[in-house]
């Protein structure tokens, strides 16, 4: 049964951030969206291949919530929350979409305190992660995807370079949180950032609502 939907990128699990496969089969039952079935903690999850029983590939579904409790680290000083997806491997476009699906954006770093806080969370890891830096706009120049002002800079030496091919930014543990520009299409881990909004309603991703389902003969939507 085929269904047009926005790809929902998974968090954690064992699928490296790959999107949900909809529908998927779990415990002899077909699911057309994220489910908490089989979980005592109530977290919504999905399979990333059609048959969970066969492949056992899964991840948690992104949730837009007004807190930073699940999957997020909160900086008590600034109230900003951060999500480090070390096990994921997504392009910058996919990483940006994953953050957006959680009411967040890719990481922006606007002051030295924030850089220091991020460096602390990166301690012990060896990784290169997508952040919100990009020069994808024709108006020119590097910018943050969440439109924060680019007032603090931490480029590595000789960076950015190669303007026609490397238009998205990464943060690297190898250079103590220094920034580089890279080809946006390569698959890397990524960091999301959000500011909790007291008025926001928690909304699970019901991206399959009100969508026409097209099924093979003998299948039921």
């Amino acid at each position: 049964c085929a269904l047009p939907y926005h790809e929902v990128y998974t968090i954690q699990g064992n699928s490296h951030g790959k999107p949900c496969t909809i529908p998927f089969k779990y415990d002899n039952q077909w699911f057309h969206g994220c489910t908490s079935t089989g979980r005592e903690d109530g977290h919504l999850w999905c399979a990333t291949t059609q048959d969970y029983g066969k492949d056992e590939r899964w991840g948690f579904c992104p949730i837009k919530s007004n807190d930073c409790e699940t999957f997020w680290d909160k900086d008590q000083l600034t109230d900003s929350c951060y999500q480090f997806n070390f096990q994921s491997t997504l392009s910058w476009r996919e990483a940006w979409a994953s953050c957006e699906q959680q009411g967040a954006d890719l990481l922006s770093i606007t002051e030295i305190h924030e850089q220091t806080y991020i460096n602390g969370l990166l301690t012990g890891y060896s990784s290169t992660l997508w952040i919100g830096l990009n020069d994808l706009d024709t108006s020119g120049g590097w910018q943050w995807s969440d439109n924060s002002p680019l007032k603090y800079l931490n480029w590595e030496s000789d960076q950015p370079d190669n303007p026609s091919e490397e238009n998205c930014g990464v943060i690297r543990t190898e250079s103590s949180g220094g920034w580089q520009n890279r080809d946006c299409s390569i698959a890397l881990p990524y960091v999301c950032k959000k500011k909790p909004n007291a008025t926001a309603e928690p909304t699970p991703p019901d991206r399959w609502a009100n969508v026409k389902v097209e099924c093979e003969p003998s299948w039921q939507p």
């Epitope: 790809e7 392009s91 476009r93 706009d137 190669n162 303007p163 026609s164 238009n167 946006c184 299409s185």
Partner: antibody, heavy 117, light 108 residues
């Protein structure tokens, strides 16, 4: 203002050769990869070849491999396409295009190559 | 054959809305760009990345994408929008650019 101006097109017999040129101005040519894109009469756009800023890496579509060579002269702000063993199916308008971020944001006006006996 | 797939032709009544789609594996990892081409002219970039427009492009042109599909929407189509539209994206390191086959938009 970014400008790309192609030249060198014309009528050539099958098996013949042509060298296209693209004169670039208004930007730091040596910082950008450059591309040739073609369009056969009444058909769609087809990427032909690409060259890195320093000329160290070149790629081309399979149908022109071994026949077409892309090159550049950064001191002259110029891009070239040497076309050998031309075939009727190579008849097209050839555009020089500069990439921006994930797009080809500047194009020349094109030069027509006609391969016919 | 194109690495990106577009419908060959669509028509739209003057002032109405038309949506052109483009599908391909490279769109999972890359943003699409859209070009307008009128007869005898070079392609002109109209929409890029998430939903950016170069200066001089009217705001009736907009873009969106999800998964392996990108869309160009013309809201309130004008007679001057009649043209061929091509989608394009970064592709692979050895074949850096992919193009769709083009969609001819006719304004009735």
């Amino acid at each position: 203002e970014v400008q790309l101006v192609e030249s060198g097109g014309g009528l050539v017999k099958p098996g013949g050769s042509l060298r296209l040129s693209c004169a670039a101005s208004g930007f730091t040519f040596s910082s950008y990869s450059m591309n040739w894109v073609r369009q056969a009469p009444g058909k769609g756009l087809e990427w032909v070849a690409n060259i890195k800023p320093d000329g160290s890496e070149r790629h081309s579509v399979d149908s022109v491999k071994g026949r077409f060579t892309i090159s550049r002269d950064n001191s002259k702000n110029s891009l070239y396409l040497q076309m050998n063993s031309l075939r009727a199916e190579d008849t097209a308008v050839y555009y020089c295009a500069r990439p921006g971020a994930g797009r080809l944001d500047y194009w020349g006006q094109g030069t027509l190559v006609t391969v016919s006996s | 054959s194109s690495e990106l797939t577009q419908d060959p032709a669509v028509s739209v009544a003057l002032g109405q809305t038309v949506r052109i789609t483009c599908q391909g594996d490279s769109l999972r990892s890359n943003f699409a760009s859209w070009y307008q081409q009128k007869p005898g002219q070079a392609p002109v970039l109209v929409v890029y990345v998430k939903n950016g427009r170069p200066s001089g492009i009217p705001d009736r042109f907009s873009g969106s994408s999800s998964g392996n599909t990108a869309s160009l929407t013309i809201t309130g189509a004008q007679a001057e929008d009649e043209a061929d539209y091509y989608c394009n994206s970064r592709n692979s390191s050895t074949h850096p650019w992919a193009f769709g086959g083009g969609t001819k938009v006719t304004v009735l």
